[in-house]
């Protein structure tokens, strides 16, 4: 169940977000989330994950990019980018994904 909290060993992560008590936190994994709200600059938040590990597998979009890692302070120097908005091409692309 992805909503259940992880009870494994905890890792120390860099914490830089409006939800941090201090500069580090302890969690099941470390996170970096880059979010762009409509009409605003993107904001990058670092912290700890304990629930919803499925978010780590999400693909980047033009609005959010979610990164997870599992080692000590592994989220400290990670920088994310958002998926660029692609204008519709005039002809179908031929390169497979």
């Amino acid at each position: 169940d992805p909503v259940k909290p992880s009870r494994g060993p905890l890792v120390t992560c860099t914490c830089e977000s409006p939800h941090c008590k201090g500069p580090t936190c302890r969690g099941a994994w470390c996170t970096v989330v880059l979010v762009r709200e409509e009409g605003r600059h993107p904001q990058e938040h670092r912290g700890c994950g304990n629930l919803h590990r499925e978010l780590c597998r999400g693909r980047p979009t033009e609005f959010v990019n979610h990164y997870c890692c599992d080692s000590h302070l592994c989220n400290h120097n990670v920088s994310l980018v958002l998926e660029a908005t692609q204008p519709p091409s005039e002809q179908p692309g031929t390169d497979g994904q």
């Epitope: 909290p5 409006p18 939800h19 941090c20 008590k21 201090g22 304990n50 629930l51 919803h52």
Partner: antibody, heavy 113, light 110 residues
Framework: EVQLLESGGGLVQPGGSLRLSCAAS????????MSWVRQAPGKGLEWVAN????????NYVDSMRGRFTISRDNSKNTLYLQMNSLRAEDTAVYYC??????WGQGTLVTVTS | QSVLAQPPSASGTPGQRVTISCSGS????????VYWYQQLPGTAPKLLIY???KRPSGVPDRFSGSKSGTSASLAISGLRSEDEADYYC???????????FGGGTKLTVL
Amino acid sequence: EVQLLESGGGLVQPGGSLRLSCAASGFTFSSYAMSWVRQAPGKGLEWVANINQDGSEKNYVDSMRGRFTISRDNSKNTLYLQMNSLRAEDTAVYYCAREFDYWGQGTLVTVTS
Amino acid sequence: QSVLAQPPSASGTPGQRVTISCSGSSSNIGSNYVYWYQQLPGTAPKLLIYGNNKRPSGVPDRFSGSKSGTSASLAISGLRSEDEADYYCAAWDDSLNGRVFGGGTKLTVL
């Protein structure tokens, strides 16, 4: 859009009880720690209690520990504060807050005989 | 008496820069992040600064925060009449295992 809507406030006699609720919407409620903060009329902000994402960890200000109980129901996206043995000095606006950014508009609790 | 100490009042004229101080101890400001909230009359507090000096999306860059040791400050430049409000600092306190607030500073724009 993040929204927090408190309810359950009102007039209560000293020694009485109230249960406050905070309905959350616009975000994944189960991913965030939550708090209750209160503000007596004309006074400053006072932290009451907080609860972690799954409800397994709770912290209280000393003066309210034992009388107040914080809880949450993630399936209903709702935060609660059970307040017992209320005193006149508990009269305040009680705010529900997502730690540590968004706040609701508050619900007024008045304790008087 | 609040755990974090703030001046009860501050004032300035439009366009001026004003600074509000917040003093704590090693168990709160000294080891944890400082937050600043603005409370306009009759409304709920709004987050202005988190993580000592970071602004949430939508907060004007006229507002800035800083921290040194066990003290912090909020600076407001280019003061406007709509900045008239109560301002609160806050931090987590490791000794109390809870959130602590300053007593609030009432800012008047003259």
